[in-house]
Structures are given as C-alpha cells and as structure tokens.
C-alpha cells in the first residue's frame, strides 16, 4: 500500500525517503520512478543515484536533502495536477531481494488563490510571505521584507522570476483571497 | 568507539551569551549530521536545529531561529552551539547527537546551562 | 509543524508485564519515526528507527510498529532496568519533533 502525500499547484512537492548507509561513504544505488515500484528497479525513472553520485535525474526532479548521508527525498519543482499518482523510492541494497520499497502517492490540489473583482490588497497580506530554498532536507522558509502593492500580472511574472531564479519555488499554502 | 563529548557546564548572567561545544571522536563528523537537543529539567526533549558539517548548512526549529546559532569546525571534528540573549528559560541540558540520516544514534553527555544573575 | 501526542504520560506496572505506549503524529509520517529511552539522570539512548527497527544492541523484549500516523512502543516482561521515560520522535520534516515522554513506572 501507499503512503499519501499532498501538494498544491505550483508548490514543491517533497516526497521524503531515507536509508542508513551501512558505513560512511558506502552508498547504495536509489531509483526514483513514476508508478508502483515493479518487481525490479524502478519504472518511468525521474532520479537515480549510484554508489557516488546522482548520476540520472529529469527536469524539476531533485533530491532535497544530502544522499550521501541517506537522505534521498524527492524534491518535484512547480508541481502540476499532472504529477498526482504514485512514486516509487527503491533503495538497491545488494542481494537478492533486498531492496526496500517505498511507494508514495502524491496527491496534487489546485491552488488556494483566487482572483477577485475588487481592490487589490498587498502582496504580503494576500500570502504568508514564505519562500523556499534550494537547500538540503524539508523546505525551510524565509521571510521577505514587505512589498509594495502588486496586482496578479505582476504577482505571476514575480513569481516566475523567483522561480527561474531558483531562490524560490512556491508560495505555498496561501489560502488568500487576492483583492 | 563512537562518542560525542560535550564542553562543561556553565553558569552565565542574563543577558549574555554562551557557546557550547561536542566534539566528536571515533567518527567525522562531515559524514552525519549533528544536532542540538534541549531539555528543561523534569521537561521532554526539543529539538533546536542541526548542521551538516560538510557544507555548513543549518536548519532550525522556529522556536530557536535567532536564538541560537549552529557551527561546526570540520578540522577539529567539534560542532558548536552559539545561544544569546540569554534569560532563565534558556537554563537547561543541552544535548548534542548524530544523525543518520533522521533518527539519533549517538548522544554527548549534555551540558547544563544555568542562567541566573 | 507535526505534532507527536505520546500516551500515557505515565504508567506503572509490574515486572514480568507487557506495556504500550502510543505515539499518535498530527501528520503522516509513513515510518519516519524513533524511540528513545531515558533513564533517571542519563541521556537518551536509541531504541528503534524506522518506526521497528531494533538497534544495535536494544534487547528483544523492545519492539515498534505503526505507520503513517499511528505508532507503538511494546515492551514485554517488563524488567527493572526499564524503569524509565520513553519518546517518539519524527524525522520526516523540519522541525523534528519529540513526543512528551511517557514515563514508566514499576509497582
């Protein structure tokens, strides 16, 4: 069975997997992939380390946290009702059928924020003004300073040069009524 | 043998600031993560924050964001926790340990923190 | 952040007894959950990761299970060195979090 995870449209999805490397630096190979994990390896895959590096990985797909200290979570940038479905972590431990499977279903919600026909408001009191990094482990979020009054035209291309910019990648959990 | 040892405790003045120590031994630090854990007396366990050695990257709980201040000095093997603005609801066990990668497998010692004037 | 409500917050019981304690996440953690235990006056020590992986050295009579959000601590015939607080702690999102402790008493 798997595990539900949630994520709203045009947030980072963060799907959390983590091994104990048997000694440091002793890596083992990890598969992340679109679908149920098979049998064997990982099908559709998104990411795949080795024993040294990440040595596979697709647009917007990236581990989070540092896979050299077991920490293999699943980073999905901008996420779209497109990513819903479920994501296999497979952790390749050598041996017959050793490895440890981990399917994790992501469930994707339409964003929060609705535009509304009257005055429009500032851009901090619409959102909750938190921004991600693209550091290591679960997001971690920064606070702005204040903004001046924006409208949503310029609320979309901000939001796009932060993203394009990589300092940010969502603006989440607004629940905000943009006025 | 895998130990993490903490520096001694410390009686400091409201107000000002202190830096604890663990350094650790039987392992490198730059592999694990190290974190930093409180305990009130006769309270539970909070968590402050961690570092990645290797990179110098912190997380901290919200709670301890600008209180506390997480190092580490990968030449020495020790990490540091830096806390300010001291009042007595800082006095407390603090406990460094490792990680690997998100469950505790070794703890130091602790290091009692009084605050008092 | 996600809540770890630990129950009871304290319990007695005999030598020889099988005990449980609950560790109930506000969130889904799927098994990115530890035990501890922390005897009067000493520090932590692991007991179990991954929500019911022993580890290295913990005695048979400790097991875990659960996931998600639902998780056990069961120790059985009770001995009197399991005299102790006992804390789940979640690892799957900053910040970590413990929770309260159970504290475990012999009659």
């Known amino acids: 069975s798997e595990v539900e995870y949630r994520a709203e449209v045009g947030q980072n999805a963060y799907l959390p997997c983590f091994y104990t490397p048997a000694a440091p630096g002793n890596l083992v190979p990890v598969c992340w992939g679109k679908g149920a994990c098979p049998v064997f390896e990982c099908g559709n895959v998104v990411l795949r380390t080795d024993e040294r590096d990440v040595n596979y990985w697709t647009s917007r797909y990236w581990l989070n946290g540092d896979f050299r200290k077991g920490d293999v979570s699943l980073t999905i940038e901008n996420v779209t009702l497109a990513d819903s479905g479920i994501y296999c972590c497979r952790i390749q431990i050598p041996g017959i059928m050793n490895d440890e499977k981990f399917n994790l279903k992501l469930v994707i919600k339409p964003a929060k924020v609705t535009p509304a026909p009257t005055r429009q408001r500032d851009f901090t009191a619409a959102f909750p003004r938190m921004l991600t990094t693209r550091g290591h482990g679960p997001a971690e979020t920064q606070t702005l300073g204040s903004l001046p009054d924006i409208n949503l035209t310029q609320i979309s291309t901000l939001a796009n040069e932060l993203r394009d910019s990589r300092l940010a990648n969502d603006l989440r959990d607004s629940g905000a009524t943009i006025r | 043998e895998v130990q993490l040892q903490q520096s001694g405790a410390e009686l400091v003045k409201p107000g000002a600031s202190v830096k604890l120590s663990c350094t650790a031994s039987g392992f490198n630090i730059k592999d694990y993560y190290i974190h930093w854990v409180k305990q009130r007396t006769d309270q539970g366990l909070e968590w402050i924050g961690r570092?990645?050695?290797?990179?110098?990257?912190?997380k901290y709980a919200p709670k301890f964001q600008g209180k506390a201040t997480i190092t580490a000095d990968t030449s020495s093997n020790t990490a540091y926790l830096q806390l300010g603005s001291l009042t007595s609801e800082d006095t407390a066990v603090y406990y460094c340990a490792r990680s690997s990668p998100y469950y505790f497998d070794y703890w130091g010692q602790g290091t009692t923190l009084t605050v008092s004037s | 952040d996600i809540q770890m409500n630990q129950s009871p917050s304290s319990l007695s019981a005999s030598l020889g007894d099988t005990i449980t304690i609950t560790c109930h996440a506000s969130q889904n953690i799927n098994v990115w959950l530890s035990w501890y235990q922390q005897k009067p006056g000493n520090i932590p020590k692991l007991l179990i990761y991954?929500?019911?992986n022993l580890h290295t050295g913990v005695p048979s009579r400790f097991s875990g299970s659960g996931s998600v959000t639902g998780f056990t601590l069961t120790i059985s015939s009770l001995q009197p060195e399991d005299i102790a607080t006992y804390y789940c702690q979640q690892g799957q999102n900053f910040p970590y979090t413990f929770g309260g402790g159970t504290k475990l008493e012999i009659i």
């Open positions: 991954k929500a019911s």
């Open positions: 570092i990645d050695p290797d990179n110098g990257e912190t």
